[in-house]
């Protein structure tokens, strides 16, 4: 007995589409083997019409597709524009057509019902508008016009020309009588409901000479489009509901129990808490179409989504809708990365951003998610050397470690930096990921002067104190610019005396600038790293002024440190704070990471990899 399962019989009518789901045991081999749909011939062979390896028969060109859903152990064959020639016996299967891993499906396509019994068939999508046309003869031009709906055995009046409207249709139906030249009246029903479907009879006149016309109204619940995305990746729902609802509030909702559809986001400003920080509703076009992007996909995001238009901003009977069934593939190609990164005021964070390694040349971006209105994500930095002005000197996007990951370092943290940030590229849009930065209590690990002034032509030495916890890390100084942070020579000056309870493994590493020039003015970072993985950083702004007295300058912590939250007004720059960065190696291990942040009282930082537990920033 074949383990493949599907519908034994599918009945449809000409012009329609069918969507045939075939189920298979989701073993590793089955998931990856060829899937096919073939038509059985009279002599027992089975001619392939479409397969998962890209083959499409000329008979199916432009009207069929086959989609595999390995996570579910299903594949779906969609066939459009059916004709009676498509009637026959088919197989859906795995592997080679003749090997028996298949299921027999009988497809029967009959003539459309619109061709039968003088009944005009109207097939309209849920929430849309239908116009039922009713012809009549001259002798009935002045007589009552009416539309009935067949309920069981009895016709029930829906609307008539005397002004009656059935309560089920109030506010969404009208009867139009054309000008005297046209012997036609029409009934327009808006915001169609599933319950509107059925047999209608329109009539002109009430006696035996009345004119009658039958109509069959089919209201289509939209078949959900199947969407298959990777865990931790992103999905975009494109919603085009038509210009007639261009000025009506739009929504995306997720079906839960029964008929309920919980609003995920709408244009009235509502957003479900579960999607905070990872959803954007893109502004709609003039034609009323819009799109919703969700990043950081979770297993529980899977389900049926509807987009629609209604003044309430939520699903109501008669809302025009589009539907999707979202599957979230847990065998994701997108690597795990922390969903929460913690740092302290005055400290720093280093965020690892995954991207599709096939697109190493793509431009990388980092943006800050803003929840106002429908959500937006203004860019802060890119890999082409652009940094938003307010972030100069404290934000850098590095291509390292490469091979599918880039790093973003943000230092001089303040409480205002808490929030959600998105990693993205101009390549594969499915690789958008989200990270939340949280500011926690604590002190920065690295200690540097708060502000430094150098004298033209003299030598400047700037200290950076590294606690013993970083004894095994590479320590560096670099000069920040828009494209990164260029490494500079530095000197290890032995153990630091800046730390209580810290042994000989603490270090004081100094940056020396000889014969200072105007070009030396700018931001300097000291930091730690292991290979291409960056840890904490701290930043110092070096101002350059004219010579006042001879000699070299040695800057100490005591003389130059800025107080917590103090604005360094004399240098004309924003407050200068200590910073430190999380060590990405630790991200990968999903362990707590030592990290410092924005307050001058500083603290350590740690990261979370998607679990609801947040790890503390204990030192290691």
């Amino acid at each position: 007995k074949s383990p493949i399962f599907g519908p034994e019989e599918v009945n449809s009518v000409e012009g329609n589409s069918v969507s045939i789901t075939c189920y298979y045991p989701p073993t590793s081999v089955n998931r990856h083997t060829r899937k096919y749909w073939c038509r059985q011939g009279a002599r027992g062979g089975c001619i392939t019409l479409i397969s998962s390896e890209g083959y499409v028969s000329s008979k199916y060109a432009g009207r069929a597709n086959l989609t595999n859903f390995p996570e579910n152990g299903t594949f779906v064959v969609n066939i459009a524009q059916l004709s009676q020639d498509d009637s026959g016996r088919y197989k859906c299967g795995l592997g080679i057509n003749s090997r028996g891993l298949s299921f027999d499906v009988s497809l029967e396509v009959s003539q459309g019902p619109g061709l039968l019994n003088d009944t005009k068939v109207y097939t309209v999508d849920l929430g849309r508008t239908v116009t039922i046309n009713c012809p009549f003869k001259t002798e009935n031009a002045q007589k009552r016009k009416s539309l009935y709906k067949q309920i069981g055995l009895y016709p029930v009046l829906v609307i008539d020309s005397s002004g009656y409207v059935n309560p089920n249709y109030t506010g969404r139906i009208r009867l139009d009588i054309q000008g005297t030249g046209q012997l036609l009246f029409s009934v327009v029903i808006n915001q169609l409901r599933l319950s509107d479907a059925g047999q209608y009879l329109c009539q002109a006149g009430d006696d035996s000479n009345s004119n009658k016309k039958n109509a069959d109204l089919q209201v289509l619940k939209p078949e959900p489009e199947l969407v298959y995305e990777d865990l931790r990746g992103s999905v975009t729902f494109h919603c085009a509901l038509g210009p007639e609802v261009a000025n009506v509030a739009k929504f995306l909702c997720r079906q839960s129990s029964g008929e309920n559809c919980d609003v995920v986001v709408n244009t009235l400003g509502k957003r479900a808490p579960a999607f905070e920080g990872r959803i954007l509703l893109n502004p709609q076009d003039k034609d009323g179409s819009f799109s919703v992007v969700i990043t950081g996909l979770r297993k529980e995001d899977a389900g049926r989504y509807l987009c629609g238009a209604h003044s309430d901003g939520q699903l109501q009977e008669g809302s025009p809708i589009q539907a999707w069934q979202l599957f979230v593939n847990e065998e994701s190609t997108i690597p795990r990365s922390p969903t929460v990164v913690k740092g302290v005021a005055g400290g720093s964070v280093a965020v690892l951003c995954p991207y599709n390694r096939k697109e190493s040349k793509s431009i990388k971006y980092w943006c800050l998610w803003e929840g106002a209105q429908n959500g937006r994500c203004p860019l802060l930095v890119d890999s082409e050397g652009w940094v938003k002005a307010q972030y100069e000197g404290r934000l850098s996007l590095l291509e390292e470690p490469g091979n599918g990951t880039f790093t973003v370092i943000l230092n001089q943290l303040t409480s205002r930096d808490a929030g959600f940030y998105w990693c993205l590229t101009n390549g594969d849009t499915l690789w958008r990921t989200t990270v939340e930065i949280k500011i926690i209590e604590g002190e920065p690990n690295l200690k540097v002067p708060g502000n430094v002034t150098a004298v033209l032509g003299e030598t400047l030495k700037v200290p950076c104190h590294f606690p013993c916890k970083f004894s095994s890390y590479e320590k560096y100084w670099c000069k920040w610019n828009n494209t990164g942070c260029q490494a500079l020579p530095s000197q290890d000056e032995g153990p630091s005396k800046a730390f209580v309870n810290c042994d000989e493994n603490s270090r004081l590493v100094s940056l020396t600038l000889n014969l200072v020039t105007r070009a030396d003015e700018g931001w300097y970072w000291c930091g730690v790293k292991q290979g291409h993985f960056y840890g904490e950083t701290a930043a110092v702004y070096v101002a350059v002024e004219e010579r006042k007295a001879a000699g070299s300058r040695d800057v100490s912590l005591a003389k130059a440190d800025a107080a917590p939250d103090e604005k360094v007004l004399d240098s004309g720059f924003r407050e200068i704070e200590n910073k430190a960065i999380q060590d990405p190696r630790l991200f990968a291990e999903e362990k707590a990471v030592a990290d410092t942040r924005d307050q001058a009282d500083g603290s350590r930082a740690s990261v979370d990899s998607g679990s609801s537990e947040e790890q503390g920033g204990s030192s290691r």
Partner: nanobody, 128 residues
Amino acid sequence: EVQLVESGGGLVQAGGSLRLSCAASGRTFSSDAVGWFRQAPGKEREFVAHIHWSGDFTTYYYYGDFVKGRFTISRGTAKNTVYLQMNSLKPEDTAVYYCAAPKGAIGDPRSTREYDYWGQGTLVTVSS
């Protein structure tokens, strides 16, 4: 509240036929799929048949392995009734037959977990 009510069960001789009905009621019922399952004494509930329709005259019919052309699932003209026509009945078809409906989109129609509404069942006894 949605209610599913099965009827048409009873005692029949081997080789005979029965037609089971499943009537749905309730203001919120708008399912476009109904399944039949059966449960013999001391056994697990077993998939019998499933029908899924869309408003554009397309209908999909699924059957359990053991059916082998003996049973036919269909939808009544009232649109809220589904039938299971059972022919060539065998003693091993003796069971309580249940109809079930999902709230929304369905995955594998053979899985009881996919269905949200269940009837109370109707007993079919096939004597030899």
